[in-house]
Interface confidence: medium
Amino acid sequence: STTKCTVSHEVADCSHLKLTQVPDDLPTNITVLNLTHNQLRRLPAANFTRYSQLTSLDVGFNTISKLEPELCQKLPMLKVLNLQHNELSQLSDKTFAFCTNLTELHLMSNSIQKIKNNPFVKQKNLITLDLSHNGLSSTKLGTQVQLENLQELLLSNNKIQALKSEELDIFANSSLKKLELSSNQIKEFSPGCFHAIGRLFGLFLNNVQLGPSLTEKLCLELANTSIRNLSLSNSQLSTTSNTTFLGLKWTNLTMLDLSYNNLNVVGNDSFAWLPQLEYFFLEYNNIQHLFSHSLHGLFNVRYLNLKRSFTKQSISLASLPKIDDFSFQWLKCLEHLNMEDNDIPGIKSNMFTGLINLKYLSLSNSFTSLRTLTNETFVSLAHSPLHILNLTKNKISKIESDAFSWLGHLEVLDLGLNEIGQELTGQEWRGLENIFEIYLSYNKYLQLTRNSFALVPSLQRLMLRRVALKNVDSSPSPFQPLRNLTILDLSNNNIANINDDMLEGLEKLEILDLQHNNLARLWKHANPGGPIYFLKGLSHLHILNLESNGFDEIPVEVFKDLFELKIIDLGLNNLNTLPASVFNNQVSLKSLNLQKNLITSVEKKVFGPAFRNLTELDMRFNPFDCTCESIAWFVNWINETHTNIPELSSHYLCNTPPHYHGFPVRLFDTSSCKDSAPFEL
């Protein structure tokens, strides 16, 4: 092909090539052709004769102003036609007359201001019609009933001001899953406008300035329709009362989106008419007071998003939003509650009472003053089968005994990114009989004791990154009770002292993160009492991260028990010489990272066992000594292996001898080296 299109599996991509005409030298069997972002003004039908197998043609982002009706005659199998971002202004009855198999027609961002006659009457198979971002002033797309299989009609960002039944009755035989009318200037819903449509399941009116009054009229027009999903995001709905959604009483609405409305007053019984509602989006509002009956009637809601719904008006404490006790008691089916990023003063004793099916609760950055978690804080969740609780970013500084004793079903507890600074006695976790993961990373400091985790033997994941861990070297080990632990993160703690029994008994441990600590002394032969073998017995360990610890020595038997190790990260240390046979037992090793160390020599007796089944190796930025003795075996291995070695050409450079300084290791000539036999498996 003389054009620079890329062709793969019957798909031709000719985008961004400044083409002024359709290429005539592509394979004739292509089924998908992408001609977007070029300089096409016309699509001569004759140019497509050879591409009769096309099922998808995308000519978006060109300057096409006219479409030849014959185009679809040449493309009888065409199902998807994308003409977005062109200069079409007129659609005649014949424009798409031969496009009878189309399922998708994209005409967004053209200059179509009016639809004359019936340009879509032949599109009996059309499922999606996108006319958004044009200059349409009405929803009138024809004069007779048509588009019986249409499911999505996208008309957002036009200039539609009224919905009229006589304009929508062309959809009398259609079942629209999505009628997208967002970002229009709709000011009128004429009587019967939605009843003109055969069945309407989804209506999207985001960014339409409805306000409370027009919203009420809209809902009355939707009465006795098939509406299931209604989206009214950013529709200036500042207040709701018990009449706002009255019309929806005669529907089976299951999804309602009222996000981004600056909603500040939610009157009692506002949603009493929505007993079928399952998904309710109220994020990014400005609710100042949630009354005890504001959410009354929402018996079937399973998902409720209240992210950034309660924000303070000023720096005055008096302006903090209020949530009455028992406000959520009506939500008997609620499983997922998101209350992130709010300015709620605190948790009251009956805040969550009645949420008898709640499984997921996110309270990240929700409170202005939740400094201490007491044994009363979560009492209102005592009868909730809560599985996941997110308490991140709340400036929590202390957890008192029995704080979570009400949460016997809890599996995941996230307390990260707080300011917790305390001794963990272990009583904090009492009652967490089913706990699977505790995330405590990024807190101020945690002082461990032998009983810190004695009451949570079910724990499988414990994250303690960057918490200035104290007493990690106490005996018996604080981790001794955690026989089921599979992931332990102790990274970023500047730990300098640990005992050889710190991880004793953690036979199920699979992932151990110890990066960014100060463990170098523990592996020095000169260490009083000899090296500390803190990895002993971890026979199921899969991933070990020891990056950035200042190691300059590795004891020969330190990895001896780690038969299942798949990934070792020893990067950013000061390792120079590794003992022979250090990796002898690592038969499962897939990834080895030794980048940014001081390794000069890569010898078979050290690295041979480790490299045997490796899929990824990272030894970048080491000061390799490019002599036969030091790297001949390595170079031969590099040139034979299928192992992925990123940046091999640029970041594996000789440091010595001087005449090789800066020379790529892989280009080192081993032919003159004695015993440079072909690479042995």
């Epitope: 990114l417 600074g421 990024y442 101020k444 400091y445 960057r466 200035a468 970023n492 500047n494 960014h516």
Partner: antibody, heavy 119, light 108 residues
Framework: GVELVQSGAEVKKPGESLKISCKGS????????ISWVRQAPGKGLEWMGV????????NYAPSFQGQVTISADKSISTAYLQWSSLKASDTAMYYC???WGIGGMVDIWGQGTLVTVSS | DIVLTQSPATLSLSPGERATLSCRAS???????LAWYQQKPGQAPRLLIY???SRATGVPARFSGSGSGTDFTLTISSLEPEDFAVYYC?????????FGQGTKVEIK
């Protein structure tokens, strides 16, 4: 108001010992950790280590481990930085600073103590 | 340790101009634990920005911080005469806290 007041400038000879102090006032001294930061003449800031005055737990930057000792006496709301054997390269301005929030960022600084080591 | 590299070393601007200071980390900081400090000659540093983008109490709105991962920026929208000083970035993502080498903002 909240402030940290450091002891005065010191001139010492190589091999001598030294202990400088930092007294906190206007807040509960045990509620916040105290960091020590070095600034050699004409150079940038170097974090040396931190102490939790409530229990004297310390954490040092690797390059200062074993070179200096950080301590505190919570009864008099004072933190200390000491050397057992000064070197000429220890000549610098030393700041104590109050860590805030999660720890690490510093909201209140002492006025600094200039230590000059010269034979 | 995480190395912070600030650029440029010196920035020569006039009052009223916009100053953009860069701080690049040698390792990815997956939580934006980065602060900016201002230091004037003979004075202790002063906290301006913490958590990459939150302004400290009493810091004028002309100072703003942005960025994540490895690239962070301090912007002074319109320089006032009192803003000419040395600015340091500092990461506290790692418990081994590190500072950048500083950017001096001087009068042109």
């Amino acid at each position: 108001g909240v402030e940290l007041v450091q002891s005065g400038a010191e001139v010492k000879k190589p091999g001598e010992s030294l202990k400088i102090s930092c007294k906190g006032s206007g807040y509960s001294f045990t509620d916040n950790w105290i960091s020590w930061v070095r600034q050699a003449p004409g150079k940038g800031l170097e974090w040396m280590g931190v102490i939790d005055p409530s229990d004297s737990y310390t954490n040092y930057a690797p390059s200062f481990q074993g070179q200096v000792t950080i301590s505190a006496d919570k009864s008099i709301s004072t933190a200390y930085l000491q050397w057992s054997s000064l070197k000429a390269s220890d000549t610098a301005m030393y700041y104590c600073a109050r860590e805030w929030g999660i720890g690490g960022m510093v909201d209140i600084w002492g006025q600094g103590t200039l230590v000059t080591v010269s034979s | 340790d995480i190395v912070l590299t600030q650029s440029p070393a010196t920035l020569s601007l006039s009052p009223g101009e916009r100053a953009t200071l860069s701080c690049r980390a040698s390792q990815y900081i997956d939580i934006s634990y980065l602060a900016w400090y201002q230091q004037k000659p003979g004075q202790a540093p002063r906290l301006l920005i913490y958590d990459a983008s939150s302004r400290a109490t009493g810091v004028p709105a002309r100072f703003s911080g942005s960025g994540s991962g490895t690239d962070f920026t301090l912007t002074i929208s319109s320089l006032e005469p009192e803003d000419f000083a040395v600015y340091y970035c500092q990461q506290y993502y790692s418990l081994s806290i590190t500072f950048g080498q500083g950017t001096k903002v001087e009068i042109k």
